[in-house]
């Protein structure tokens, strides 16, 4: 079995019990399906500043249930989507008609999940099916990403002192996507 | 360790109010996540809304628009106003915790809630 992707695309389930992995090293693009209120983290938007502090993206919780086609988790569990703008600090003004418009330059700036924290769930299956444990990974932290004209799209560098660090010794792995997508679109999400 | 006890429920109308509360016992209860779920007779137990310490709150459709869940920390109290009530969110309503990023552990004994039309 491959990943199993729930609502939003940053939690998987885990087949091997015993792993931790690393979170995945490309930026998944597409929105995040759940409905969040009320940000935790009021959104940022820093003007003409390199200061790193200055970058931040807000991370919205929400609470939902497991699933893993008819199977679906004896408890709820809870964690974070990321949202919101991250920058850059440079806008420049671009005239529409009357009304005027703004648009980013410079390199483009992603929140992104950044920590993950490994949870045992067990699932329950209807028609009797033996209950499974899984592991699956929440999002614990959310965090600025810069990617670069220059670059591809899953080549993101960390916003902060470190550079992304390549996954050594560790195969990709297939990630497929959950087909429900029950709850509208969180707006600004990615 | 965290315990939850919740009240406010009863018989109402529909298109009446009731203000649920979820009473905590333990020194932690301001860093967890709370969250109010249902169940109907007959069907799962399903989410309503949830809040976390700093306030941030999440809504299910069901009750988005009628719901509102708020908490205050110094009271150890999480509540859930809810207005427009329909016959259909008749249930048991509980109250859990969880830790930011986890699995809700910790449950109340949950508080009964009918809705007559």
């Known amino acids: 079995q491959g990943w199993q992707a729930f609502k939003n695309d940053a939690t998987e389930i885990i087949p091997e019990l015993g792993e931790y992995p690393e979170p995945p090293p490309e930026l998944e693009n597409n929105k995040t399906m759940n409905r969040a209120e009320n940000g935790g983290r009021p959104p940022h938007h820093p003007f003409e500043t390199k200061d790193v502090s200055e970058y931040s993206c807000r991370e919205l919780h929400f609470t939902r249930y497991v699933t893993d086609g008819p199977c679906r988790s004896a408890k709820p569990v809870t964690e974070l989507v990321c949202s919101g703008q991250c920058g850059p600090a440079r806008l420049l003004p671009n005239a529409i008609g009357r009304g005027k418009w703004w648009r980013p330059s410079g390199p483009d700036f992603r929140c992104i999940p950044d920590r993950y924290r490994a949870q045992r769930v067990q699932l329950l299956c209807p028609g009797g099916e033996a209950p499974r444990a899984r592991k699956v990974r929440l999002v614990a932290s959310c965090k600025c990403k810069r990617l670069t004209r220059f670059h591809n799209q899953s080549e993101l560098k960390d916003f902060g002192t470190e550079a992304a660090r390549p996954q050594k010794g560790r195969k990709p792995r297939p990630r497929a996507r959950s087909a429900k997508a029950n709850q509208a679109e969180l707006e600004n999400a990615y | 360790e965290v315990q939850l006890v919740e009240s406010g429920g009863g018989l109402v109308q529909a298109g009446g109010s009731l203000r649920l509360t979820c009473a905590a016992s333990?020194?932690?209860?301001?860093?967890?996540?709370i969250g109010w779920f249902r169940q109907a007779p007959g069907k799962q137990r399903e989410v309503v809304a949830s809040i976390t310490s700093g306030g941030s709150t999440y809504y299910e459709d069901s009750g988005k628009g009628r719901f509102t869940i708020s908490r205050d920390n110094a009271k150890n109290r999480v509540y859930l106003q809810m207005n427009s009530l329909r016959p259909e969110d008749t249930a048991v309503y509980y109250c859990a915790a969880a830790e930011p990023a986890g699995v809700y552990d910790v449950w109340g004994q949950g508080t009964q809630v009918t809705v007559s039309s």
């Open positions: 333990g020194r932690t209860f301001s860093s967890f996540v």
